[in-house]
Interface confidence: low
């Protein structure tokens, strides 16, 4: 249906306050660096604009494309240049290819510092003195570090975060209220952020195909009572929703996200018993509860998969005259009979099943060359659940730091090109699926774990991407979405690297050491790690435990001397010294 | 714009109080939350009140709680600091600070518009 007015449409669609949440998070994930008051003023005359075309749909300005309008304002801002450098020439493009080149701009790792939040009692004045500018403000910086997170989700935290203040800012101890459920909700933004930009990535590289495969089978897992035209039509919808918020258009995929939890809702009978309770919440909750919804049991009726992919004559007819619907429905079919399997591991054995057909359908006789094909699944199988075998048993044996720089360990040898900062930032990240994942019972381990080390392994192609250094990194990051993991568990030593040169001041300490929180100590110590590493790529695992091993008595002698900073810089030297000669 | 100008400061006894006032011309002042900063010789600028734009809302730095209050009077466009029970530690230039989109209230970077400074000095 056609508007006389888009943004009329989406500002009467979403109503004001969402509206304004999503302008205000779409211009801080286009201009990362502006100050939240600019960002403030922008979203206030967009949100203005927008009433005033929903008065009057023929007003001045008010039928042209969103992307127009939100390119006109961008291009308004006066430090465009001077902040931006090379951005600015984006404005003298059209549209669409100016919108294209605001989205090839957004920095997946803007280097802004981590967000520290002042104390309980500052957090709680502001929030109860203007709540909207506190909510504005938390929009603001979280979208400006995640310039690709799901915006109708940001929205829900923020709601979320909201809901955690009117709580605790009345407890008797607010600090100890905020702390952990701030805590909490953190861990959780994070995890989104970068589900998104997996998505995101899936989209933007592997195409709308890759999405499609990775929904169908992910959703044919969580409603295995739903038909496959179900399914089809509720991935289909996702990937519009996606496309929208990976593309910068926030409105439309909010609205449409809306649209789809609507749907879904009118529709449960024929997709989940487990949509109830979702569905009589509010729009925002009410579409983060089915995102979360717990998997449907399995009908008790499936017949086997045999039947329809192996053993019905037909299958080479089945498959040629339409293949994407054919393949879909085995990805559907396994899928929904697998709910312990990854999705990774899912794409792979329909992609295993689609190079059998091509091969087989080609021959004399492809009943008997395919005969065997559910069989030969068998080795991609057990990879994946061998691999989070060993991984847990290694996990539970040295915990989650000891994991974290085994590693570091091991992603440093086989990509000692890498920057230290992403290999400290993706090895703690890979670490974290062992909290994460171990404890879950064997049949939800393999999922878990898997589907976890894909999102963060794209956190690695992403920034990877931006600098390319190694021809390795690109290969495995590039070739195929679903054999990213495998393709890095595979990488051996880097035998071509040429080891750095040493540098004294890498492996100099302050007495600031000591007063970092654990988690910044632990960065600190694993960055040591890396670079000795890239000094001596050649060093045991045997030589870098008593390294490190060292290293952790001398932060610890240092930090409880009397003169630290002393210490610091008279032990230091020693301590090198005698790492270089463990390391020969 | 908005000009903000200090006065109130001078010399008192440790024990003593003095009461500090910030006006503010060129604009009303009910849109911004006020906050007093100081920097004391050879050390960083730091946090020491503020009050959100209704007067609702006030908050200290730990080291002045309890013996400092601000208070404001959007009528007269003047943000106040009380100063109760001084201290030799409390010797320091204090500076009004404005801050239009402030949210949290204790980073300087908030504040969008400041003072020139009035000096306080605690000594017997």
């Known amino acids: 249906e056609a508007y006389k007015s888009e943004i009329a449409h989406r500002y009467n669609d979403l109503g004001e306050e969402h509206f304004r949440g999503l302008v205000l998070v779409a211009f801080s994930q286009y201009l990362q660096q502006c100050p939240f008051e600019d960002h403030v003023k922008l979203a206030k005359e967009v949100t203005e604009f927008a009433k005033a075309c929903a008065a009057e749909e023929s007003g001045a300005n008010c039928d042209k494309s969103l992307h127009t309008l939100f390119g006109d304002k961008l291009c308004t801002v006066a430090s465009l240049r001077d902040k931006y450098g090379d951005m600015a020439d984006c404005c003298e493009k059209q549209e669409p290819d100016r919108n294209e080149c605001f989205l090839a701009h957004k920095d997946d790792n803007p280097g802004f510092p981590p967000l520290v939040a002042p104390e309980p009692d500052a957090l709680c004045a502001a929030f109860q003195d203007n709540e909207q500018l506190f909510l504005g403000k938390y929009l603001y910086e979280i979208a400006r570090r995640h310039p690709y997170f799901y915006a109708p989700e940001l929205l829900y935290y923020a709601q979320q975060y909201k809901g955690v203040f009117a709580e605790c800012c009345q407890a008797a101890d607010k600090a100890a209220c905020l702390g952990p459920k701030i805590e909490a909700l953190r861990e959780k933004v994070l995890l989104s952020s970068a589900k998104e930009r997996f998505k995101c990535a899936s989209l933007q590289k592997f195409g709308d195909r890759a999405f499609k495969a990775w929904s169908v089978a992910r959703l044919s897992q969580r409603f295995p009572k739903a038909d496959f035209a179900e399914i089809s039509k509720v991935v289909t919808d996702l990937t519009k929703v996606h496309k929208e918020c990976c593309h910068g258009d926030l409105l439309e995929c909010a609205d449409d996200r809306a649209d789809l939890a609507k749907y879904m809702c009118e529709n449960q009978d024929s997709i989940s018993t487990k949509l109830k309770e979702c569905c009589d919440k509010p729009v925002l909750e009410k579409s983060q509860c089915l995102a979360e919804v717990e998997r449907d049991e399995l009908p008790g009726d499936l017949p086997s998969l045999a039947a329809d992919f192996v053993e019905d004559k037909e299958v080479c007819k089945n498959y040629q005259e339409a293949k994407d619907v054919f393949l879909g429905t085995f990805l559907y079919e396994y899928a929904r009979r697998h709910p312990e399997y990854s999705v990774s591991l899912l794409l792979r054995l329909a992609k295993e099943y689609e190079a059998t057909l091509e091969k087989c359908c080609a021959t004399d006789d492809p009943p008997t060359c395919y005969a065997k094909v559910l069989d030969e699944f068998k080795p991609l199988v057990d990879e994946p659940q061998n691999l989070v075998k060993t991984n847990c048993e290694l996990f539970e044996k040295l915990g989650e730091y000891g994991f974290q720089n085994a590693l570091l360990v091991r992603y440093t040898k086989k990509a000692p090109q890498v920057s230290t900062p992403t290999l400290v930032e993706v090895s703690r990240k890979l670490g974290k699926v062992g909290t994460k994942c171990c404890k879950k019972p064997e049949s939800e381990r393999m999922s878990c774990a898997e589907d976890f080390l894909s999102v963060v392994l794209n956190r690695l192609c992403v920034l990877h991407e931006k600098t390319p250094v190694s021809e390795r990194v690109t290969k495995c990051c590039s070739e195929s979405l679903v054999n990213r993991r495998p393709c890095f568990s595979g990488l051996e030593v880097d035998e071509t690297y040429v080891p750095k040169e040493f540098n004294a001041e890498t492996f100099t300490f302050h007495a600031d050491l000591c007063t970092l929180p654990e988690a910044e100590k632990q960065v600190k110590k694993q960055t040591a790690l890396v670079e000795l590493l890239k000094h001596k790529p050649k060093a045991t695992d045997e030589q870098l435990k008593t390294v490190m091993g060292d290293f952790g008595a001398f932060v610890e002698k240092c930090c409880a001397a009397e003169n630290k900073e002393g210490c610091f810089s008279e032990e230091g030297p020693k301590l090198v010294a005698a790492a270089q000669a463990a390391l020969v | 714009e908005v000009q903000l100008v200090e006065s109130g400061g001078g010399v008192v006894q440790p024990g003593g109080s003095l009461r500090l006032s910030c006006a503010a011309s060129?604009?009303?002042?009910?849109?911004?939350?006020m906050g007093w900063f100081r920097r004391a010789p050879g050390k960083e600028r730091e946090f020491v009140a503020a009050i959100s734009r209704s007067g609702g809302y006030t908050y200290y730095a730990d080291s002045v709680k309890g013996r400092f209050t601000i208070s404001r009077d959007n009528s007269k466009k003047t943000a106040y600091l009380q100063m109760n029970s001084l201290r030799p530690e409390d010797t320091a230039l204090y500076y009004c600070?404005?801050?239009?989109?402030?949210?949290?209230?204790?980073?300087?970077?908030?504040?969008?518009?400041w003072g020139q400074g009035t000096l306080v000095t605690v000594s017997s």
């Open positions: 060129g604009s009303t002042i009910s849109s911004y939350v």
């Open positions: 600070a404005a801050g239009r989109y402030s949210a949290w209230y204790s980073q300087s970077y908030e504040y969008d518009y």
